[in-house]
Interface confidence: low
């Protein structure tokens, strides 16, 4: 009779991690008795997977039933598949022995890889607001694939960037890898409702990909344009004098008033206009009693937004141009949202 | 829930003019932009304009200045669009819609059901 | 005015196609907005900022483009797809539409 041959017919098996991996294994002859056992790896350190006769593997689960005495089908499948068990896996025939039974022949090995899908990506943008015209940068991070290829590229509204780093960790052999991206995105003001999108594609995924986005509304700070402009005299004594503070983003923002250097009036912005481009408008009006006044008046509109140093503009009154002084008060009156940029 | 309801249909007389309304519902009145769209049978669309009901701030597409004008009412959330000097070329459906990205939860455009304006003597 | 040009006008995919119709503005712009109208209906916004699709739309829809030139993509047909699509720039006003493309069911 021709001696026992181990067949292992399958040189690799790929796996989705959570998915069963089935190994398979023959032999040729029921002779010599002795049990079947399966390693991951060879040499001194291997890792014992199943033994036909003794032993505990909740994992593992026989395609054929191995009581049967005429049984030369000797393939495992192992259940719940994760990165950590990629691996050569060899199917040893033993003989029966005393008082141990001894190593006969092994199969040439079936090397078993995961493919472990990436996480879903994660974006994050700079800790601090940035202005249009700005570079910011970007990071993606995406863990635990298998195997190491992968595709990772950066959108914004759609529009594909060119401007990136990757890296893939580790560089060596390992059971599974992560990735690691930079890209450089030029802010432009019409950003607040751009997304940046992380888009990672990998075997495991059959064409469709993972994303990650991001909001540039997070990002951006889209500073104001202010314009402060006298408006027709509404009564004999007094004049009205609004601040239109234009193209703002986010909406965080301080409007002070002040005559002559001095504060008059300090609002904070709340009924604000949204533009089409996400940004906001708002205006602030003052009515100011020219006839408290002996001289000419310097208004000034000064506006902190989202914490940045104030910006401000300043208009002057001129008083000789108005009548004659009634009453002594300076008056004041605000409002909000009030305008609109047309593109 | 966001909803635009407009006027209904109306057949006008050339030379007269017609006011059509859209009553929002469901968010902010005053702060969303409130549009104006035309569509004659079988032709694409047309911008007309948008007014801002709270600050009846307008923007008119120039082909239409003198055609057509926005008003707001606050009280009844409404707006208004009065087409004047009527012709057969102002025979379409008028929809009003508006934009507004952050105000609802399952959309960020909306439109009317559209008001059909037949001109014919 | 930015005039948008829609092609083709009229065309016809069988159900499973991909289908993918085009926008071109005489002008950049920054961003295109896409509508798909049925008939005795309003315009349906499909997809706004050039490729972000608005809510409860399929994923079969994507938009993408920069420019002068944008495209709206149906990447397997379906039969409640037949309708007229129109591209929109928000822009320069007047905020100008495309002469929409016909899609019927072949």
């Known amino acids: 009779e021709e001696e026992l041959q181990v067949i292992q017919p399958d040189k690799s098996v790929l796996v989705a991690a959570g998915e069963t991996a089935t190994l398979r294994c023959t032999a040729t002859s029921l002779i010599p008795v002795g049990p079947i056992q399966w390693f991951r790896g060879a040499g001194p350190g291997r890792e014992l997977i199943y033994n036909q006769k003794e032993g505990h593997f909740p994992r593992v689960t026989t395609v054929s039933d191995l009581t049967k005495r005429n049984n030369m089908d000797f393939s495992i499948r192992i259940g719940n598949i994760t990165p950590a068990d990629a691996g050569t896996y060899y199917c040893v025939k033993f003989r029966k022995g005393s008082p141990d039974d001894v190593e006969f022949k092994s199969g040439a090995g079936t090397e078993l890889s995961v493919r472990a899908k990436p996480s879903a990506p994660v974006v994050s943008g700079p800790a601090a607001r940035a202005t249009p015209q700005h570079t910011v940068s970007f990071t993606c991070e995406s863990h635990g694939f298998s195997p190491r290829d992968i595709t990772l590229k950066w959108f914004k509204n759609g529009n594909e960037l060119s401007d990136f780093q990757t890296n893939v960790d580790p560089v060596g052999e390992s059971v599974s890898y992560s990735i690691h991206s930079t890209a450089k995105v030029v802010l432009t003001r019409e950003d607040v409702h751009s997304q940046v999108i992380c888009e990672v594609a990998h075997v495991t995924l059959q064409g469709d990909p993972l994303r990650g986005t991001a909001n540039l509304s997070e990002t951006i700070r889209v500073p104001p344009t202010l314009e402060v402009t006298q408006q027709p005299v509404r009564a004999e004594n007094q004049v009205n004098v609004t601040c239109q503070v234009r193209k703002f983003y986010p909406q965080r923002l301080q409007l002070t008033w002040l005559e002559n250097g001095n504060v008059s009036r300090t609002e904070t912005a709340s009924t604000v206009t949204e533009n089409k481009d996400g940004t906001y408008n708002w205006m602030s009006w003052l009515l100011v009693n020219v006839s408290a006044h002996r001289d000419d008046v310097k208004l000034t509109c000064q506006v902190e937004h989202d914490g940045q140093p104030a910006v401000s503009k300043s208009h002057d009154l001129k008083v000789s141009a108005h009548p004659k002084e009634q009453g002594s008060n300076t008056a004041a009156e605000n409002t909000g949202s009030n305008e609109r940029n047309i593109y | 829930q966001v909803q635009l309801q407009q006027s209904g249909a109306e057949l006008m007389k050339p030379g007269a003019s017609v006011k059509i309304s859209c009553k929002a519902t469901?968010?902010?009145?005053?702060?969303?932009?409130i549009e104006w769209v035309k569509q004659r049978p079988g032709h694409g669309l047309e911008w007309i304009g948008e007014?801002?009901?709270?600050?009846?701030?307008?923007n008119y597409n120039e082909k239409f200045k003198g055609k057509a004008t926005f008003t707001a009412d606050t009280s009844s959330n409404t707006v208004y669009m009065q087409l004047s000097s009527l012709t057969s070329e102002d025979s379409a459906v008028y929809y009003c819609?508006?934009?507004?990205?952050?105000?609802?939860?399952?959309?960020?455009?909306?439109w009317g059901q559209g008001t059909t304006l037949t001109v014919s003597s | 005015e930015n005039v948008l040009t829609q092609s083709p006008a009229i065309m016809s995919a069988s159900l499973g196609e991909k289908v993918t119709m085009s926008c071109r503005a005489s002008s950049g712009v920054n961003y295109m907005y896409w509508y798909q109208q049925k008939s005795d209906a309003s315009p349906k916004l499909l997809i706004y900022?050039?490729?972000i699709l608005a809510p409860g739309v399929p994923a079969r829809f994507s938009g993408s483009g920069s420019g002068n030139s944008y495209s709206l993509t149906i990447s397997s047909m379906e039969g409640e797809d037949a309708a007229t699509y129109y591209c929109?720039?928000?822009?320069?006003?007047?905020?100008?539409f495309g002469g929409g493309t016909k899609l019927e069911i072949k």
């Open positions: 929109q720039q928000f822009t320069s006003s007047p905020y100008t």
């Open positions: 469901g968010y902010s009145f005053t702060k969303y932009w």
């Open positions: 007014i801002l009901p709270g600050s009846v701030i307008t």
């Open positions: 819609t508006k934009w507004g990205l952050y105000d609802s939860d399952d959309g960020v455009d909306y």
């Open positions: 900022y050039t490729s």
